[in-house]
């Protein structure tokens, strides 16, 4: 029973950081503007993955894709890269995991099958977690870089009384969605690779008894297996399982006014 | 077509209050920011704030905060300012304009006067 | 506040003359973003509300006539009427769109001769 419900909130809580890691791609807001030192803006910018967008205080909202590939910051595409490779590995272990459910009978699946399974959507997971977390902290890093690199520029170009400032940008709502997501992913993930211990079929050791025999040296086993020759051989015995349901006696493992002057 | 219309001419007392209105018509009112503008005569103009009739917000010029309060009446598709503590610096034609898309005013009211006089 | 300096503060031309007015603002009004100048021009007849001619610094308002031109970017901005009418007779002013709060020009008066 514990096992089951390990896989089962390991899946649930894979699918829901799959969402978010999706959700978080599709996102525009991975980096908004600084508004610290310029709160009076009329015109506020804000920028994804995939495209940027202008929203005025109007409430209009324009929004303008990268329609260049080469132009882009190699950073970006490997930002991009990172979230979808997160995106496919995530969709293709849930594929798995789905069939890998032990609530879930197709045909006459073996548990060892449902174990590999399992362990594979978990590793799954796991690297699509990863994936997120790196293609997130990239693009935070970047914009670190960024942000302290444009108030080190603040008001170049000052002459006279005329100030030209630099727009600069901080962590959107994106970056937080992705590091959550990720983490959830991951935790999922982890979760499916515990469940898949619990699943395997038990190894386990019978001490043999040893009878002996005159003229003959053979070890006999109980539990009906085969015996196997070899004084005092220490040879492990799997159990054989009949398909039908069985007891687990693992522990189970447990979300404006504004006023300006 | 759009129209926005406003209340006549008012004639106050100093340290008195005054609520101007501006009705819209021809327009999906709750979607666009309503601005107000001051006019003082023979002088330029003046921006005081900016109401969403749709959920209320306001944004005000730290000059006209705590003097105008701007409301809306989305059942009768009308914005009010009122201006309290009126001295004969307030005396000007007020404006009320729709504010679109590029942050700019497209139609204005014809103006409403208000006179603070004793 | 962002400060709009307009010159001249007023001009007279003759019907068919070319006029050119300049704006400048104490802060830069182009987004980085999206590349546009938050700047807009309004015509003010007398007795009449200000008129939308310009947003965006150089998009026309729909129903005004070609003969109205904006231009610049950053801080220096100019409407030009390349052939005077006399409806044209009116206060034009400048206004920064870009920053809280909005802050107008003084305007430039036009005078026909």
């Known amino acids: 029973m514990a096992v089951t419900a390990c896989q089962g909130l390991g899946f649930v809580v894979s699918l829901i950081g799959i969402a978010g890691i999706i959700a978080a791609t599709c996102m525009d807001q991975w980096s908004t503007q600084d508004l610290y030192n310029n709160p009076v803006t009329a015109v506020f910018n804000y920028q994804g993955l995939w495209r940027s967008c202008v929203r005025e205080s109007s409430g209009f909202t324009e929004c303008r894709g990268y329609f260049t590939l080469l132009g882009l910051p190699a950073m970006l595409q490997a930002v991009r890269a990172l979230m979808i490779v997160g995106i496919v590995l995530g969709a293709i272990g849930l594929l798995v995991s789905i069939f890998a459910l032990k609530c879930i009978r197709i045909g006459s699946m073996e548990d060892s099958a449902k174990a590999n399974m399992t362990l594979t959507s978990g590793i799954m997971f796991i690297v699509s977690g990863l994936c997120a977390i790196a293609g997130v902290s990239v693009f935070a890093n970047m914009l670190v870089t960024n942000f302290w690199m444009s108030t080190a520029n603040m008001y170049t170009g000052m002459g006279g009384m005329v100030q030209t400032v630099q727009t600069r940008y901080t962590f959107g709502a994106a970056l937080f969605v992705g590091w959550v997501a990720g983490g959830l992913t991951l935790i999922g993930g982890v979760m499916m690779c515990i469940a898949c211990r619990g699943l395997a079929p038990e190894e386990t050791n019978y001490k043999a008894v040893s009878y002996h025999a005159s003229g003959h040296s053979v070890a006999y086993k109980p539990g009906g297996f085969k015996a196997s020759t070899g004084f005092g051989s220490n040879t492990k015995n799997k159990k054989i399982y009949d398909g039908g349901a069985r007891t687990e006696d693992e522990v189970q493992s447990y979300p404006s006014k504004h006023d300006y002057v | 077509q759009v129209q926005l219309q406003q209340s006549g001419a008012e004639l106050v007392r100093p340290g008195s209050s005054v609520k101007i209105s501006c009705k819209a018509s021809?327009?999906?009112?709750?979607?666009?920011?309503m601005n107000w503008v001051k006019q003082r005569p023979g002088q330029g103009l003046e921006w005081i704030g900016q109401?969403?009739?749709?959920?209320?917000?306001?944004t005000y010029n730290g000059k006209f905060k705590g003097q105008a309060t701007l409301t809306a009446d989305k059942s009768s598709s009308t914005v009010y300012m009122q201006l309290s503590s009126l001295t004969s610096e307030d005396s000007a034609v007020y404006f009320c304009?729709?504010?679109?898309?590029?942050?700019?005013?497209?139609?204005w009211g014809q103006g409403t006067s208000v006179t603070v006089s004793s | 506040d962002i400060v709009m300096t307009q010159s001249p503060s007023s001009l007279s031309v003759s019907a068919g003359e070319k006029v050119t007015m300049s704006c400048k603002s104490s802060?830069?009004?182009?987004?980085?973003?999206?590349?546009?100048?938050?700047l807009a021009w309004y015509q003010q007849k007398p007795g009449q509300p200000p008129k939308l001619l310009i947003y965006?610094?150089?998009t026309r308002e729909s129903g005004v006539p070609d003969r109205f031109t904006g231009s610049g970017s950053g801080t220096d901005f100019t409407l030009t009427i390349s052939s005077v009418r006399a409806e044209d007779l009116a206060v034009y002013y400048c206004?920064?769109?870009?920053?809280?709060?909005?802050?107008f020009g003084s305007g430039t008066k036009l005078e026909i001769k």
């Open positions: 304009a729709r504010f679109v898309k590029g942050n700019a005013m497209d139609y």
């Open positions: 021809g327009y999906a009112f709750s979607s666009y920011w």
């Open positions: 109401i969403y009739p749709g959920n209320g917000d306001t």
């Open positions: 802060q830069s009004l182009l987004n980085s973003g999206n590349q546009k100048n938050y």
């Open positions: 965006g610094a150089s």
């Open positions: 206004q920064n769109d870009h920053y809280y709060p909005f802050t």
